[in-house]
Amino acid sequence: EEELQVIQPDKSVLVAAGETATLRCTATSLIPVGPIQWFRGAGPGRELIYNQKEGHFPRVTTVSDLTKRNNMDFSIRIGNITPADAGTYYCVKFRKGSPDDVEFKSGAGTELSVRAKPSAPVVSGPAARATPQHTVSFTCESHGFSPRDITLKWFKNGNELSDFQTNVDPVGESVSYSIHSTAKVVLTREDVHSQVICEVAHVTLQGDPLRGTANLSETIRVPPTLEVTQQPVRAENQVNVTCQVRKFYPQRLQLTWLENGNVSRTETASTVTENKDGTYNWMSWLLVNVSAHRDDVKLTCQVEHDGQPAVSKSHDLKVS
């Protein structure tokens, strides 16, 4: 006469995070009397998941009614699965005994693998702005995914980047994983409107990758070019001198006029014009009373852009 066998027909079960896992188990006999218990893992440190005899297991429901006479189906459902639930689950028959029930026979185990979506990629750039021709680093992070296999790509304005390094942690087995990637990007003067995109593809995303973006407008600083020009002499011996401040970004800019090294006027860029590439232009002018000067006048347009050291351009005004 054959003694009871515990049959777990599924070697492995794959479930998406948040869903319900069904772990199947049947016994071939009602003998001996005693409960079925489910455990995660084996050995002394195994974790009790369900006990037919006693206890409260709010996430677990039985597939069939275990109070039904002749029931030999001990399958269970575990609700709201998370990556932490991954592991091998054993259906174990116990024999009624005193003072404790005695383990009688175990099923072969079912490995529960949890598919968990990666979190939305977060892209972060350098702490300080950089100027064109400089190389800056961007990082992309995504967490909580399983299984470990994942693909990460970098793009700048739709063009795939190749200069990046990616790590998936931890290296060994884990319930879930994180990805960290650093890409190097060379800035150009036209990058104010550019975007850097980190794209993450994973089996849980059904071919619809997640994207994280960073705007290079947060990273780039385009220093201005200055041009000082003298307009024709106007009535009453007044000369109009203009300072053209071109192609700068961001807008934060302060301009100071100096006459022979002495501060004449300071103003902050306000009514700027925006270029197609996202940079700004601004113009300031100075009316100089020629009759007030006996000698030639050196006019200097000094610009402090975005907290950087001032740049200047001078113009010599002839007094004849």
Partner: antibody
């Protein structure tokens, strides 16, 4: 689905008897068979349960004198060193208790121990 | 070993009455629910009514119900029918698989 007992009768004190319990309509392979007796005018008394070869157990008072066995279709209860107080109707029932209760019962067979 | 005590030993009742029988264990039964109720009529084998303390056996009328846990259990017949006059036994199981003991029985008689 039924259980039919046989083998009861008159036996002298110190004698032996083997009761049979034949199942029809179901196999005994995955079920325990329990034996219960009832002395005339008295209540029910659990004797023991026959599961598989390694799984048989008996009430403390029955150990030693009562031995059970079964095939897929018939269960047996071997009784030795019988005494007058063993006089009773002997029932077999399908089940092992707890979540496997005694749901099918035989009609009973009378064992009389007397000289 | 576990001991099972049924009370009362007999009860007289009329058809339509609500009847409550009690069974007390000397210690908690196995799993707090290893308690079954059987009905026996003269000259017949016992019949399973309730198992696991409160689960109604197949084919048993719903007027029978079981309750209780641990050491104290009851069998209730909500509206006694003529065919219910019989003796009722509880069977309790202790922690050891061989520790199955019947109570002394309660006879339900016609008043």
């Amino acid at each position: 689905r039924q259980l039919v007992e046989s083998g009861g009768g008159l036996v002298q004190p110190g004698g032996s008897l083997r009761l049979s319990c034949a199942a029809s309509g179901f196999s005994l392979s995955s079920h325990g068979i329990s034996w219960v007796r009832q002395a005339p005018g008295k209540g029910l008394e659990y004797i023991g349960t026959i599961g598989t070869g390694v799984i048989t157990y008996y009430a403390s008072w029955a150990k030693g004198r009562f031995t059970g066995s079964k095939t897929s279709s018939t269960a047996y209860l071997q009784m030795t060193s019988l005494r007058a107080e063993d006089t009773a109707v002997y029932y077999c029932a399908r089940g092992s208790a707890w979540n496997d209760p005694f749901d099918y019962w035989g009609q009973g067979t009378l064992v009389t121990v007397s000289s | 070993d576990i001991e099972m005590t049924q009370s009362p030993s007999s009860v007289s009742a009329s058809v339509g009455d609500r009847v409550t029988l009690t069974c007390q264990a000397s210690q908690s039964v196995y799993g707090n629910n290893d308690l079954a109720w059987y009905q026996q009529k003269p000259g017949q084998a016992p019949k399973l009514l309730i198992y696991l303390a409160s689960t109604l056996a197949t084919g048993v009328p719903s007027r029978f119900s079981g309750s209780g846990s641990g050491t104290d259990f009851t069998l209730t017949i909500s509206s006694l029918q003529p065919e219910d006059f019989a003796t009722y036994y509880c069977l309790g199981g202790g922690d050891d698989e061989a520790d199955n003991v019947f109570g002394g029985g309660t006879k339900v008689e016609i008043k």
